[in-house]
């Protein structure tokens, strides 16, 4: 069978080979399409409701004034010329529709390096057959499930027209130290290769590089955090980040009702001050970051203090990690 592709809504003429150019003609067209139960026979006499869908022209060709999805199928013509020689024509008709230009919607203006980000959703409306959407980054194809690339696809079919809407949501994890202004685009490739790809406008989000979080250090004075009753303990929260974050204090996992400050002074220590202390640094650009916790304890007269330098040690004296 000869393959014929026809655009939806356009007219189509199929030649009946070997048919006399003018009546009288001995020919018969047989159709097996989405409009027929099995084979439908059409003769030059025509007439009836089929004339609006397909009719035989005076020269024996079959004329379809506006091809639709239901016209996909097999078309056969059997003709006899004046000398009684029989000729058969056999066509396999497939239809297509080119969608409008695809678009990227819900596109991100900024991506964060090192974490998965949604770049945007590519939408193509009105294709047949469905076709495919694919993504490009800086002119190179993106392959789903490779190098931090993931794509969520959805295909819907219009209940009346039968045309397809495709959606493709792109997620990427930009590499740290990579291109600060990557260029993404999406293109629609037709299911029937009778048309070139259709490409969206490019988008160029910025890539934001989060500053690697340096640890929040908690320094205790006196070293070790053990002090005689009535003594003073000074806790200092050191954060290398700029600009300086807000520092709040916690005791035994509960926030202390104090104004933000990088230094906490516990004067005239009493039993009620014993416990586990930590500080929390809150950055504007990312969430809170908590220091390691230290224990503050009272040394009764005659007791040995903990080993010097045991802040953050495990199980050394009375000062330990929470």
């Amino acid at each position: 069978a000869q393959n014929i592709t026809a655009r939806i809504g356009e007219p189509l003429v199929l030649k009946c080979k070997g048919a006399p150019k003018k009546p009288p003609q001995r020919l018969e067209w047989k159709l097996n399409t989405g409009r027929t139960e099995a084979w439908k026979v059409l003769s030059p006499q025509g007439g009836g409701p089929w004339d609006s869908v397909a009719r035989v022209l005076p020269n024996g060709s079959l004329f379809l004034p506006a091809v639709g999805i239901q016209d996909e199928g097999i078309f056969r013509c059997q003709a006899m010329n004046r000398n009684g020689k029989e000729t058969k024509s056999n066509y396999r008709v497939r239809v297509y529709q080119i969608p409008g230009k695809p678009e990227i919607v819900d596109s991100a203006s900024e991506l964060t390096a090192g974490v998965p980000n949604k770049v945007g959703t590519c939408v193509s409306e009105g294709s047949y057959p469905a076709g495919t959407l694919s993504w490009h980054l800086d002119g190179k194809p993106l392959v789903p499930n490779e190098k931090g690339v993931s794509v969520k696809e959805q295909t819907r079919r219009h209940p009346e027209t039968g045309l397809f809407t495709l959606q493709s949501e792109l997620m990427v994890t930009p590499a740290r130290g990579g291109d600060p202004r990557p260029t993404f685009s999406c293109s629609f490739s037709p299911g029937l290769p009778r048309h070139r790809a259709l490409r969206t406008a490019p988008i160029q989000p910025r890539v934001w590089e989060p500053v690697p979080l340096e640890e929040v250090q908690l320094v205790v004075e006196p070293e070790g955090g053990a002090v005689a009753p009535g003594g003073t303990v000074t806790l200092t929260c050191e954060v290398p980040a700029q600009p300086s974050p807000q520092i709040h204090w916690m005791k035994d996992g509960v926030p202390l009702p104090l104004p933000p400050s990088p230094v906490l002074i516990l004067p005239e220590i009493g039993p009620q001050d014993q416990g586990t202390y930590s500080c929390v640094a809150t950055h504007s650009s990312h969430g809170p970051q908590e220091s390691r916790a230290v224990s503050i304890s009272i040394i009764e007269p005659g007791e040995e203090g903990p080993t010097a330098g045991s802040v953050g040690g495990s199980g050394l004296g009375t000062l330990a990690l929470a």
Partner: antibody, heavy 115, light 112 residues
């Protein structure tokens, strides 16, 4: 019908710059990529870069970064390519073309760099 | 970048003969996401702009005579002219448009 009309030939001195134009007609200028391609005399084709006139985002072949600069004027439906610090190596015919693959081409602009 | 290599660099045939020319890419131009080969062929006649003949490796551009046929997949492609005409005198370029854009060096077709 789609047409890309390029500016005329240029004879320029080494070390100077040149700007060549590509006027589009017969379609919506802001909806399609315009590419630029270089062809040295008797040689093959070399892709330079593209511009999307709708949002003037550009993309360049690594080799032409710093050499070529692509711009577009929506009001006149014209794309431009400026070539800077010209040497004899830049003597070539430069084509503008639309979409990928390149179905529509300008007629080409000959740039001759000579002292 | 993907390198494109064409062979032969030139050939001379008589009108009516069949001609084939080859194009090889340094890596596959078949895109797994849609199973299409991003390979095009152009014809450039002397003093003219290139003209698109074939895209998706085998789809003829509208208006291109059916004596021009593209075939192949992955890295190996062929352009065939079934019956060469005098007006086919030109240089033929292959072009990959999957990963950025690169062209082959061209095959010059001469008519004996």
């Amino acid at each position: 019908q789609v047409q890309l009309q390029q500016s005329g030939p240029e004879l320029v001195k080494p070390g100077t710059s040149v700007r060549i134009s590509c006027k589009a007609s017969g379609y919506t200028f802001t909806s399609y990529y315009i590419h630029w391609v270089k062809q040295r005399p008797g040689q093959g084709l070399e892709w330079i870069g593209w511009i999307y006139p709708g949002n003037v985002i550009t993309n360049y072949h690594e080799k032409f970064k710093g050499k070529a600069s692509l711009t577009a004027d929506k009001s006149s439906s014209t794309a431009y390519m400026q070539l800077s610090s010209l040497t004899s190596e830049d003597s070539a015919v430069y084509f503008c073309a639309r979409e990928d693959p390149f179905a529509y081409w300008g007629q080409g602009t000959l740039v001759t760099v000579s002292a | 970048n993907i390198m494109m290599t064409q062979s032969p660099s030139s050939l001379a045939v008589s009108a009516g003969e069949k001609v084939t020319m080859s194009c090889k890419s340094s890596q596959s131009v078949l895109y797994s996401s849609n199973q299409k080969n991003y390979l095009a062929w152009y014809q450039q006649k002397p003093g003219q702009s290139p003209k698109l003949l074939i895209y998706w490796a085998s789809t003829r551009e509208s208006g291109v005579p059916d004596r021009f046929t593209g075939s192949g997949s992955g890295t190996d492609f062929t352009l065939t002219i079934s019956s060469v005409q005098a007006e086919d005198l030109a240089v033929y370029y292959c072009h990959q448009y999957l990963s950025s854009y690169t062209f082959g060096g061209g095959t010059k077709l001469e008519i004996k």
